[in-house]
């Protein structure tokens, strides 16, 4: 799996999970979140060469097409596969509110 | 939706469905498929600017992060959303075999 266990241990130019820390205030302009101040969002990036973690039959076909037609612009792209939620704390008036934001953290990637 | 109805009618630099015809023999080296000789596979390509058809909360966060940090390499990518199967005919010995290959045709795209 193109997850932290693999990607953070290996120098990998191909599609892989990349570390990305997002500071809510500085990076998103979200000043309302009390806790956490930021989080490890991660992101997916890298080349999708022939059969590198292909997601669907179409992406396998596309990577084969790209191998045989290297000048073509049609190629799979490295995107998130497994995502996890993030729990945040913010205030509505004086009332603390705990909320789970879905699909905030990328755990693994795929070529799609 | 970033589908043929929208994308094939509009000149669109942003993430959209692009036409791609694949000839089995020429483009994939698959000489065994009797019918069809090829098919409209299509593919997804184009920029994923802030909130352009964002797929998940993470891709929305990433596009916002990218807007505020334009020098960053972390940005969503244009990939397939809806896929359809393709029916093929080939021969095994003298016996014609009809098979449905899943996820062969891209019908719409998303920024993920």
């Amino acid at each position: 799996a193109l997850d932290a266990a693999y990607c953070f241990r290996n120098v990998q130019d191909n599609c892989c999970l990349r570390p990305l820390y997002i500071d809510f205030k500085r990076d998103l302009g979200w000043k309302w979140i009390h806790e956490p101040k930021g989080y490890n969002a991660n992101f997916c990036a890298g080349a999708c060469p022939y059969l590198w973690s292909s997601d669907t039959q179409h992406s396998r076909v596309l990577s084969l097409y790209n191998t045989i037609n290297p000048e073509a612009s049609a190629s799979p792209c490295c995107v998130s596969q497994d995502l996890e939620p993030l729990t945040i704390l913010y205030y509505i008036g004086k009332t603390p509110k705990i909320e789970q934001l879905s699909n905030m953290i990328v755990k693994s990637c795929k070529c799609s | 939706a970033l589908d043929a109805a929208y994308c094939f009618r509009n000149v669109q630099d942003n993430c959209c469905l692009r036409p791609l015809y694949i000839d089995f023999k020429r483009d994939l080296g698959w000489k065994w498929i009797h019918e069809p000789k090829g098919y409209n596979a299509n593919f997804c390509a184009g920029a994923c600017p802030y909130l352009w058809s964002s797929d998940t909360q993470h891709s929305r966060v990433l596009s916002l992060y990218n807007t505020i940090n334009p020098e960053a390499s972390a940005s969503p990518c244009c990939v397939s959303q809806d896929l359809e199967p393709l029916t093929i005919l080939y021969y095994i010995g003298k016996t014609p075999k009809i098979e449905q290959l899943s996820n062969m045709i891209v019908k719409s795209c998303k920024c993920s």
Epitope: L51, Q57, R60, V61, L64 | W30, K31, Y91, I92
Partner: antibody, heavy 119, light 112 residues
């Protein structure tokens, strides 16, 4: 150059299952079919079945339909064959090979995996 | 199943001689597409088979022109015009016109 690498030998007990691999290199894995053949001394060659890594399509010899299961792992360019409910009749050399289509001739063969079923 | 009968079982020859191996099928091997899917292989002791002739009469790449295949319908012949030491081994015919695909029992070419 085209290579199909198979483990040399497997020793298994009657009634058990065995999964053997065939790692392909030197060509585009998803453009060729992988075929599996059984060879017993004095019994000649028997076609077990074919699989196409590009789509996962499979075709089996009726005789082996309940005995063999063919799969591929495209990320590692590996074809696998699992044989179940093994008996002494299954002791043989099993070879993988590649071909351009179901009706095409096999153009390259693996060295074969020798399976011995014995208690 | 199509039975492939090879004769002779053993063929003793002197180096430089012509050798002829016969293969007979229990059904016609002419496909509805017009092709005859009859192939010839050579297997040397301790080695995997090597393709010599495919689709009746086509020499595989790298196969010397002293090898030739002929025949039609149900009767097929492999000829070696001048036997060399490297030609010794077991020759198999094989058909892929009918399912299940079947092989001949083999002809052992050996030195007289």
């Amino acid at each position: 150059q085209v290579q199909l690498q198979q483990p040399g030998a497997e020793l298994v007990k009657p009634g058990a299952s065995v999964k053997m691999s065939c790692k392909a290199s030197g060509y585009i894995f998803t453009s060729y079919w992988i075929t599996w053949v059984k060879q017993r001394p004095g019994q000649g060659l028997e076609w077990i079945g074919d699989i196409f890594p590009g789509t996962g399509s499979t075709n089996y010899n009726e005789k082996f339909k309940t005995k063999a299961s063919l799969t591929v792992d495209t990320s590692s360019s590996t074809a696998n064959m699992q044989l179940s409910s093994l008996t002494s009749e299954d002791s043989a050399v099993y070879s993988c090979a590649r071909k351009l289509g179901p009706n095409y001739a096999v153009d390259y063969w693996g060295q074969g995996t020798s399976v011995t079923v014995s208690s | 199943d199509v039975v492939m009968t090879q004769t002779p079982l053993s063929l003793p020859v002197s180096l430089g001689d012509q050798a002829s191996i016969s293969c007979r099928s229990s059904q016609s091997l002419i496909h509805s597409h017009g092709n005859t899917y009859l192939h010839w292989y050579l297997q040397k002791p301790g080695q995997s088979p090597k393709l010599l002739i495919y689709k009746l009469s086509n020499r595989f790449s790298g196969v010397p022109d002293r090898f030739s295949g002929s025949g039609s319908g149900t009767d097929f012949t492999l000829k070696i015009s001048r036997v060399e030491a490297e030609d010794l081994g077991v020759y198999f015919c094989s058909q892929s016109t009918h399912v299940p695909f079947t092989f001949g029992s083999g002809t052992k070419l050996e030195i007289k």
